[in-house]
């Protein structure tokens, strides 16, 4: 009875942070990006990111960006905006 | 020298669409953005959305969305945004402009504007 | 979406004037602000982006500074083709939603 409760509990949590954080919004590191923001994020709002191959455990490839909010936000690594920041972020820390 | 050459006046009634174009010369077209900025009569400027000519990856004011469509024409050099379901609110001056990452993503060459009047 | 807000939303000066305009954000928006001008029947013209840069063209009486919610832009000596309306905008994340307008009228 104990482990069907925290099943339900956990699948129950699992669906909420679904919804809070949309397929846009990886939860934590170890969640896969579902589906890409459909926003446009500035160079300025962003202090890293990290890939996510489709390869690797994850259904598609995606760039994971770190905002200054915390927040992680799913991106199309094909979309110009996108390679533009990896660009902008890949430069800064070669020039590090 | 960059230009941004947009289509004439239109009227139309209420519930009809409007396309109003946008053509680019001077510059690479698909290295830059193209925006939508409309002013009605004694309002201020209004974003509605934007579109990457190299990729045709558009993102949309939540206010427009389901009811604008921009479009882009490579070989023209050439972007469209097209209106639909038109009603009076929707008179207005309608500006294209580049947006530029290299300026802070700023809109800094305007179209001079098209005048969409709503009426029955 | 970042809501900006203007003040004045309009301003009565003379030639000669150092006037300022403010720009308030809902949120934080780092910097990822440009000011934009605006006269009658015209296109508006960029003046300042990412905050405080100068763009191509535009006298150095124009100037803009702040940072995290609230902007500034500054004209040290209004001229008379300043008489216009100012308008600010956010670009930190779609949709680049523009402050309400300031109208600088002549006094």
């Known amino acids: 009875m104990c482990c069907t409760k925290s099943l339900l509990l956990a699948a129950l949590m699992s669906v909420l942070l679904l919804h809070l954080c949309g397929e846009s919004e990886a939860a934590s590191n170890f969640d896969c990006c579902l589906g890409y923001t459909d926003r446009i994020l500035h160079p300025k709002f962003i202090v890293g990111f990290t890939r996510q191959l489709a390869n690797e455990g994850c259904d598609i490839n995606a760039i994971i960006f770190h905002t200054k909010k915390k927040l992680s936000v799913c991106a199309n690594p094909k979309q110009t905006w996108v390679k533009y920041i990896v660009r902008l972020l890949s430069k800064k820390v070669k020039n590090m | 020298q960059v230009q941004l050459v947009q289509s004439g006046a239109e009227v139309k009634k209420p519930g009809a669409s409007v396309k109003v174009s946008c053509k680019a010369s001077?510059?690479?077209?698909?290295?830059?953005?193209m925006h939508w900025v409309r002013q009605a009569p004694g309002q201020g400027l209004e974003w509605m959305g934007v579109i990457d000519p190299s990729d045709s990856y558009t993102t949309y004011a939540q206010k427009f969305q389901g009811r604008v469509t921009m479009t882009v024409d490579t070989s023209t050099s050439t972007v469209y945004m097209e209106l639909s379901s038109l009603r009076s609110e929707d008179t207005a001056v309608y500006y294209c402009?580049?947006?530029?990452?290299?300026?802070?993503?700023?809109?800094?060459?305007w179209g001079q504007g098209t005048l969409v009047t709503v009426s029955s | 979406d970042i809501q900006m807000t203007q003040s004045p939303s309009s301003l009565s000066a003379s030639v000669g004037d150092r006037v300022t305009i403010t720009c308030g954000a809902s949120?934080?928006?780092?910097?990822?602000l440009n000011w934009y001008q605006r006269k009658p029947g015209k296109a508006p013209k960029l003046l300042i982006y990412?905050?405080?840069n100068l763009a191509d063209g535009v006298p150095s009486r124009f100037s803009g500074s702040g940072s995290g919610r609230d902007y500034t832009l500054t004209i040290s000596s209004l001229q008379p083709e300043d008489f216009a309306t100012y308008y600010c905008q956010n670009v930190l994340i779609t949709p680049y939603t523009f402050g309400q307008g300031t109208k600088l009228e002549i006094k």
């Open positions: 949120e934080n928006i780092y910097g990822a």
């Open positions: 990412g905050a405080t």
């Open positions: 402009a580049r947006g530029n990452y290299g300026v802070d993503y700023a809109m800094d060459y």
């Open positions: 001077g510059y690479t077209f698909t290295n830059y953005w």
